[in-house]
Interface confidence: low
């Protein structure tokens, strides 16, 4: 999947077509049982928007765990002390006090904008991960697609979409090219750092969203 930001999408984005569950052999972008038909089933209470977002984030976190497992098994990056070396090359989204997502100084509006903006910024890094896995290739694709679905859920929830800045596709494309041109060690380290940062960002988002 080659998409650097949702700004590349046409007027319909990809509607809720993304909510359909993939065949069992392929990880879906939504948790099992989240098919639109299931949600409407008479025997089950439909999920609220907040519950769906919560479930979606936990689903992505599961996917990240699987990817981290492969990364850590493949190299010793997970124990490396040289992370700072590679981290300087990356500008991975991070939660800061001013974003209003922490308990002290919590602010729903600014926090939601930060979460959506951060996820949009992570998209180029998730694109980078697409060719970085062998046995978990499908899982990497599922994490990417699930994140797109999560962004759509959150955009529905956000009232002030004007405040959300979409990453510049040109900048993203040159960043992607630069990341792919790194030597093997740096590419492995970059993969590890992206997964770790994305996990931390999602965990912070999950905590914040539970307060909304």
């Amino acid at each position: 999947m080659n998409s650097f930001s949702t700004s590349a999408f046409g007027p319909v984005a990809f509607s809720l077509g993304l909510l359909l569950v993939l065949p069992a052999a392929f990880p879906a972008p939504v948790p099992p049982g989240e098919d639109s038909k299931d949600v409407a089933a008479p025997h089950r209470q439909p999920l609220t928007s907040s519950e769906r977002i919560d479930k979606q984030i936990r689903y992505i976190l599961d996917g990240i765990s699987a990817l981290r497992k492969e990364t850590c098994n493949k190299s010793n990056m997970c124990e490396s002390s040289k992370e700072a070396l590679a981290e300087n090359n990356l500008n991975l989204p991070k939660m800061a006090e001013k974003d209003g997502c922490f308990q002290s100084g919590f602010n729903e509006e600014t926090c939601l904008v930060k979460i959506i903006t951060g996820l949009l910024e992570f998209e180029v890094y998730l694109e980078y991960l697409q060719n970085r896995f062998e046995s978990s290739e499908e899982q990497a694709r599922a994490v990417q697609m699930s994140t797109k679905v999560l962004i759509q859920f959150l955009q529905k929830k956000a009232k002030n979409l004007d405040a959300i800045t979409t990453p510049d596709p040109t900048t993203n494309a040159s960043l992607l090219t630069k990341l792919q041109a790194q030597n093997q060690w740096l590419q492995d380290m970059t993969t590890h750092l992206i997964l770790r940062s994305f996990k931390e960002f999602l965990q912070s988002s999950l905590r914040a969203l539970r307060q909304m």
Epitope: G10, F14, L176
Partner: antibody
Framework: DVQLQESGPGLVKPSQTVSLTCTVT??????????WSWIRQFPGNKLEWIGY???????TYNPSLTSRTTITRDTSMNQFFLEMISLTAEDTATYYC???????????WGQGTSVTVSS | DIQMTQSPASLSASVGETVTITCRSS??????LTWFQQRQGKSPHLLVY???TLAEGVPSRFRGRGRGTQFSLQINSLQPEDFGTYYC?????????FGGGTRLEIK
Amino acid sequence: DVQLQESGPGLVKPSQTVSLTCTVTGISITTGNYRWSWIRQFPGNKLEWIGYIYYSGAITYNPSLTSRTTITRDTSMNQFFLEMISLTAEDTATYYCARDRYDYAVDFWGQGTSVTVSS
Amino acid sequence: DIQMTQSPASLSASVGETVTITCRSSENIYSFLTWFQQRQGKSPHLLVYYANTLAEGVPSRFRGRGRGTQFSLQINSLQPEDFGTYYCQHHYGTPWTFGGGTRLEIK
């Protein structure tokens, strides 16, 4: 008005290499959000995507053709190229260059250039 | 690779009639489906993207439907210029693949 124009040798001998050029007018191939593809159509009308080059220069190939295919570009001439090695009769097709907005659709095609592989 | 299966391979209809062409993907492709028309000796021409969005300048008699693995293109009130070959194509990741085409002929 955006236009894409393919050019190539027409006839190529088996095992040889073909080089095709796509000249783009009306838009720079470095314009953000666009990718520039090569797609071929076999005599029976079957279409096959060969690969594309992003406006940034990043390239993605069809895995089934990646070992024989190279896509490059010349931004100063606003052209992009396809080179395919070790041709066989099965590579006989009309080769199209095309533009798409990624995750959107191929919205402009060239008129196609015919490549016949024959001794 | 994702396989795209189009049916029927060919059909004949008269001007004014309504026809439906279907396209099935071997995997869920959500709404990442495009329909093209190709007239004899011409390049393919974009009709519908994202499964159901009409491209600019395409008449409203064309209608794309579906998501997931089942898609269709309906053409209402056929016009002489609608005859040709129709292709579906997915762009859910790479490699992109195309349907085998449906040839629409004048009865």
